[in-house]
Interface confidence: low
């Protein structure tokens, strides 16, 4: 890792899905951060401004992206799992974040959700679809 | 850890951003199941690792699988680690 | 906050050996990450090589198969085994630690290692 050669993560969030909630009861955000070296990063959720450790588990290292390469790019990813009824509170607000020397790259789940008529609202009744 | 009840299965999940990655969650399965590095270097997939949901006294296992390919899908993700054939949940269409 | 002392610098003829050590004043666990890096005179400063999560390595060219970087957790000290010295790797070498404490990166006040018959 040369001084020049420092490649921040990219990070992104991704929703529950619906047939999870459906089934389980129970809703798994995912984060991945990828993209980045060294593999020195941090990664932490947050819900409602606090950082959250209960229902979290993250790769206990990063993933060579190429790993027949010596100076791969590394990639990690996290899973928060909650209730479905956590999830569908419109209120409550999901943070991944993730430190790579110093700087802070994030990427979240924000309260601009529609109040759900149901509890097995689909995820497009809260603004998410892609049209 | 011992797994109660262990119900496998596979969901895709859809990112927040406009990124071209797909995201695949299998969750759920007993401790015993291994799950295999993807042979196609274009496809991610990470270790197993333990959730804990400690407020719910509930346990499990996951892993994810991701990729940029076009024509990836959660069916084929984990065709190199032993899945029973109903574990695919797909996601619903949107009713845009 | 996060200190690094380095130490083991020192003059050494062509082909001899020298074995550089970085002590953290923090405990290692909180150190993701350990590099050696060198600035001769008149030029800009160099990866010699790394050590991160793992204890996965990582070395220059010039430095590959000659220095070997190590860490002893126990000691919360990273060393750094030079063998077989040129000339050319007379400079002042410095530890760098990349720490899960704001600031985050960490550089010691380097120690000269000088290769000269």
């Known amino acids: 890792e040369d001084l020049k050669k420092v490649f921040p993560p990219k990070v992104a969030v991704f929703e529950p899905s619906e047939a999870e909630i459906s089934h389980t009861q129970k809703a798994t955000l995912v984060c991945l951060a990828t993209g980045f070296y060294p593999d020195h990063v941090e990664l932490s959720w947050w819900v409602n401004g606090k950082e959250v450790h209960s229902g979290v588990s993250t790769d206990p290292q990063p993933l060579k992206e190429q790993p027949a390469l010596e100076d791969s790019r590394y990639s990690l990813s996290s899973r928060l799992r909650v209730s479905a009824t956590f999830w569908h509170n419109p209120r409550n607000h999901f943070r991944c974040q993730v430190q790579f020397y110093g700087l802070s790259e994030d990427d979240e789940w924000t309260e601009d959700r529609d109040k759900p008529i149901t509890q097995k609202i689909s995820a497009e009744a809260w603004g998410r679809a892609d049209c | 850890p011992y797994i109660q009840n262990p119900d496998p299965a596979v969901y895709q999940l859809r990112g927040s951003k406009s990124n071209d990655t797909s995201v695949c969650l299998f969750t759920d399965f007993d401790s015993v199941m291994n799950v295999s590095q993807s042979k196609d270097s274009d496809v991610h997939i990470t270790d197993k690792t333990v959730l804990d949901m400690r407020s719910m006294d509930f346990k499990s296992n996951g892993a994810v699988a991701w990729s940029n390919k076009s024509d990836f899908a959660c069916t084929s993700a984990f065709k190199d680690s032993v899945i029973p054939a109903d574990t695919f949940f797909p996601s619903p269409e949107s009713s845009c | 906050e996060v200190q690094l002392v380095e130490s083991g610098g020192g003059v050494v003829q062509p082909g001899g050996s020298l074995r550089l050590s970085c002590v953290a004043s923090?405990?290692?666990?909180?150190?993701?990450?350990y590099g050696w890096y060198r600035q001769a005179p008149g030029k800009e400063r160099e990866k010699v090589a790394h050590?991160?999560?793992?204890?996965?390595?990582d070395y220059a060219d010039s430095a590959k198969g000659r220095f070997t970087i190590s860490r002893d957790e126990s000691k919360n000290t990273v060393y750094l085994q030079m063998n077989s010295l040129r000339p050319e790797d007379t400079a002042l070498y410095y530890c760098?630690?990349?720490?899960?404490?704001?600031?985050?990166?960490?550089w010691g006040q380097g120690t000269l290692v000088t290769v000269s018959s």
């Open positions: 923090w405990e290692v666990h909180q150190i993701n990450f």
């Open positions: 760098r630690a990349l720490s899960r404490i704001w600031p985050y990166d960490y």
């Open positions: 050590i991160s999560i793992g204890d996965q390595t």
